[in-house]
């Protein structure tokens, strides 16, 4: 875009402590508004500054100021992500497991020097408290992961920041917003039991304990019913079952019945990130000539 030789606004800057976006006004203008990351905007106070409520000191954000008349706009990034290109942590991922544990892992940046050290900070969506990594996973002394055993500070959406330090050069940071529902890996269902009568078998199980507060309606299950001692390549019976107040599946299976096994896995119905399978539970007789389920 063409540069204005006599811009009405110069020296656009963020006063971080006051959370004010401010500037120098070089001539009369009719109206000024500030735009944050093209997400929301606000009118300026007396055309001299914009008062923000919660600016991030870590998350790089575009702040644009635009003037009604004469039409003009200018912008800054705050904070700037300074440091050598390629030094930031990469391949960052996190997962919640066993309902109350979380692991995050990352790799060192390709141009990061040997003495690089990374630090993880997590802030919840309310931005009230910052969690510093309590237990780092290391590779040759460099932090490449983090283990958390207390997730009480997290909310449904959280901001993850990996800062870096080095005595040699500036290290760029990596940041990411993650939804807890997308990163939780469920445990398999527990207390799986099979009870059979002369004509049917009833499988029951308990929904896994999760970090998220979920109702039975949020779960989807898959049952793998497998006949033992069959030829390799024989298809398993995969059954999809929606979560219910009483998790159960009743299927016809008349006596005498061959030996079968059943295992179950669980997922969030919205995400379908399947858990690992539960331990296989066996039922039926060892006699290979008996009928199938």
């Amino acid at each position: 875009t063409k540069e204005d030789p006599n811009p009405p606004i110069t020296n656009l800057r963020m006063k971080a402590k006051a959370q004010q976006l401010t500037w120098d006004l070089n001539r009369n203008v009719t109206d000024i508004e500030c735009v944050k990351d093209a997400d929301y905007s606000m009118p300026a106070v007396n055309n001299s500054y914009c008062q923000f409520g919660a600016i991030s000191l870590c998350e790089v954000t575009n702040y644009t100021v635009r003037v009604a008349n004469p039409p003009f706009s200018t912008w800054i990034l705050f904070p700037e992500n300074s440091g050598r290109e390629g030094t930031a942590a990469q391949n960052f991922s996190c997962f919640i497991y066993n309902a109350d544990l979380m692991n995050c892992t990352w790799a060192r940046g390709p141009t990061a020097p040997r003495d690089v050290q990374y630090f993880l900070y997590i802030r919840n969506s309310k931005r009230r408290r910052e969690i510093r990594c309590p237990y780092y996973i290391q590779d040759s002394g460099t932090h490449v992961g983090c283990h958390l055993d207390n997730l009480s500070g997290l909310t449904s959406r959280n901001y993850f920041l990996v800062n870096g330090t080095s005595r040699e050069i500036g290290i760029q940071f990596f940041d990411s917003l993650l939804d807890t529902k997308k990163i939780e890996r469920f445990n398999p269902p527990s207390n799986v039991t099979v009870r059979c009568n002369t004509t049917h078998c009833l499988v029951r199980w308990k929904q896994p304990r999760t970090y998220q507060k979920l109702s039975y309606l949020d779960f989807q299950y898959q049952l793998d019913v497998h006949r033992k001692n069959t030829q390799p390549g024989t298809e398993n019976l995969l059954i999809n079952v929606s979560g219910d107040l009483e998790n159960r599946y009743n299927f016809p299976s008349s006596e005498p019945r061959a030996k079968h096994s059943v295992k179950i896995r669980a997922a969030d119905v919205r995400i379908l990130n399947w858990s690992s399978w539960s331990e296989a539970i066996e039922f039926g007789s060892d006699d290979g000539n008996l009928g199938s389920v």
Epitope: T1, D4, E33, S41, P43, A68, P71
Partner: antibody
């Protein structure tokens, strides 16, 4: 007298793109923002985005980022909007508008609208 | 996004009557810095583009008859037509002018008996 003259109706196939124009007269083209608004049939209005004619700086409603591209030709005082990957959801009347002296976000003057119909 | 809700969706009145219509915002449109409410009203007559009517909740655009009055503050706003004329047949839209993406209400359709 401020006038915004928009190009005629367009009938396009799904997946195609369209570029409509808006010729401004009666004022200094570079002194105001050019703004675009969508009105689906029998529905309300949606702001698409703005452009500063003097330097081409653009501001988009996130919903239309990637869908609409705004440009200007200062020599002919004409603003353009290009819409891509059209679907039936894009069938609507599109208005070009001019900002107000007092505030960039007010739609002070309106063109007559360009009807876009997306149909196989 | 700011959600703008207008009511009623339509109303029918006799010429000469007083009419009021409501617009509610999901968030406050009051700028504490200048005590202005960033709420704008537009009207759209049949077969025409919309037209700016009132800005800053209560300031009439030049050329707008004084029978049109805007009022309200924060999240609740009202447009009043003191004595409806036949030419006021239109759809009236309110608009959040405080913040991106400048959302409009669904409109109130005014019909004349």
């Amino acid at each position: 007298e401020v006038q915004l003259q928009q190009s005629g109706p367009e009938l396009v196939k799904p997946g195609a793109s369209v570029k409509m124009s808006c010729k401004a007269s009666g004022y200094t083209f570079t002194d105001y923002y050019m703004k675009w608004v969508k009105q689906s049939h029998g529905k309300s209005l949606e702001w698409i985005g703005d452009i500063i004619p003097s330097n081409g700086a653009t501001f988009y409603n996130q919903k239309f980022k990637g869908k609409a591209t705004l440009t200007v030709d200062r020599s002919s005082s004409t603003a353009y909007m290009h819409l891509n990957s059209l679907t039936s959801e894009d069938s609507a009347v599109y208005y070009c508008t001019r900002s107000h002296l007092l505030r960039a976000s007010w739609f002070a003057y309106w063109g007559q609208g360009t009807l876009v119909t997306v149909s196989a | 996004d700011f959600v703008m809700t207008q009511s009623p969706s339509s109303l029918t009145v006799t010429a000469g009557e007083k009419v009021t219509m409501s617009c509610k915002s999901s968030q406050s449109l009051l700028n504490s810095g200048n005590q202005k409410n960033y709420l704008t009203w537009y009207l759209q007559k049949p077969g025409q583009p919309p037209k700016l009517l009132i800005y800053w909740a209560s300031t009439r655009e030049s050329g707008v008859p004084d029978r049109f009055t805007g009022s309200g503050s924060g999240t609740d706003f009202t447009l009043t037509i003191s004595s409806v004329q036949a030419e006021d047949l239109a759809v009236y839209y309110c608009q959040n002018d405080y913040s991106y993406p400048y959302t409009f209400g669904g409109g109130t359709k005014l019909e004349i008996k």
